[in-house]
């Protein structure tokens, strides 16, 4: 008789999850010499230990502490790029501008990017059928708690000018309920961070509006100013040209507004 299994509303653990995490860890540590000391088997054991045999709606930041410790990595604090709802462009940017880092350019972020995982209370099984959905089931699920933990710590590490890439095509360009709006904004340290500079990425070819005047951007400016951090905003009207100019800044067409 098959054992009764909790049915959650979200997709189950990504197939071949253990192999994927281990392979990503090995690849990352091979590419990044400063992380060569990391024992990837220990990293996987710590990752697994955070959620295996635990109720997937009762995960805490403390559960991830052993993994956080093994993944400790010094990121240049003045080279941090945050993003909200525009991950692909942010990653394309840091692939070109190699001295800047998104969270997914760190070992911990790279390990978990685009993956889903959860376990079951009192069994050592990984649940490949379903995992809790943040809205429909519970917020303290393994994936959400992981991203909240690493996002908070990533924001805490930032200093000087912090950049954030925002999606100008969305109805809420700045969303208070996003990870950026609910976690990262509130964990920037005013003693270290002088300015948050928002880059609003336009979607339409003919879109010449100043999206820095959008009410949600004004809301972000208000939140940031109240935290004694300066705020600035730039429109990126042509993201394709923007990336091209990052690659080839000497190009004559790159002196005009992008």
């Amino acid at each position: 008789v098959p054992r009764w299994r909790q049915q959650w509303s979200g997709p189950g653990t990504t197939k071949r999850f253990p192999e994927t995490v281990l392979a990503r860890c090995v690849k990352y540590t091979e590419i990044h010499p400063e992380m060569r000391h990391v024992d990837c088997q220990s990293v996987w054991d710590a990752f697994k230990g955070a959620f295996i045999s635990k109720h997937p709606c009762n995960i805490t930041e403390e559960d991830y502490q052993p993994l956080m410790k093994l993944g400790t990595q010094t990121v240049p604090c003045n080279k941090i790029l945050l993003w909200s709802r525009i991950k692909d462009l942010a990653h394309q940017f840091t692939q070109v501008q190699r001295d800047m880092f998104t969270l997914e350019d760190t070992l911990l972020g790279y390990l978990a990017d685009d993956l889903t995982w959860c376990g079951e209370f009192n069994t050592s099984k990984i649940n490949y059928q379903s995992c809790p959905d943040w809205r429909k089931d519970c917020s303290n699920n393994p994936v959400s708690v992981f991203w909240k933990t690493v996002s908070r710590r990533f924001a805490e590490a930032a200093c000087d000018v912090v950049h954030v890439m925002l999606n100008g095509s969305r109805s809420k360009i700045f969303d208070k309920n996003s990870t950026f709006g609910s976690v990262e904004v509130h964990n920037l340290q005013p003693e270290k961070v002088q300015t948050l500079e928002a880059w609003v990425i336009h979607g339409g070819r003919e879109d010449s509006r100043d999206l820095c005047q959008d009410p949600t951007i004004k809301e972000l400016e208000s939140i940031i100013s109240k935290r004694n951090i300066q705020f600035s905003c730039k429109n990126i009207y042509r993201p394709d040209k923007f990336l091209q100019c990052v690659k080839n800044p000497e190009d004559s067409s790159c002196t005009s507004e992008i």
Epitope: M68, K69, R153
Partner: nanobody, 116 residues
């Protein structure tokens, strides 16, 4: 930059007690792990005890039941209460603070000598 300052070391007789303190100053953010390490002459630095921001602790087998680590998050200070000290505990004791994306910070060390 975070600076760590240890205090409380000294000379103590076998069986005696000491309490070490370590305060973090500078640009303080939410330090995740704080802990104590020690290095005896001619030996490698080893973990004595550590404590997470949430209060979970971890001890070296050799000090379990004798040493207690505690932490005051508001003061960014970590303490090490050392009881039933023996000559093998003689070492320089170093404070460590770590943040996941800012790296690891070390104090200058404080000497603990256990001798009659």
């Amino acid at each position: 930059q975070v600076k760590l300052q240890e205090s409380g070391g000294g000379l103590v007789q076998p069986g005696g007690s000491l309490r070490l303190s370590c305060g973090a100053t500078g640009i303080i953010f939410s330090i995740n792990d704080m802990g104590w390490y020690r290095q005896a002459p001619g030996k490698q630095r080893e973990l004595v005890a550590e404590i997470t921001r949430g209060g979970s602790t971890n001890y070296a087998d050799s000090v379990k039941g004798r040493f207690t680590i505690s932490r005051d998050n508001a003061k960014n200070t970590v303490y090490l209460q050392m009881n039933s000290l023996n000559p093998e505990d003689t070492a320089v004791y170093y404070c460590n603070a770590a943040h996941t994306f800012s790296g690891s910070f070390w104090g200058q060390g404080t000497q603990v000598t256990v001798s009659s």
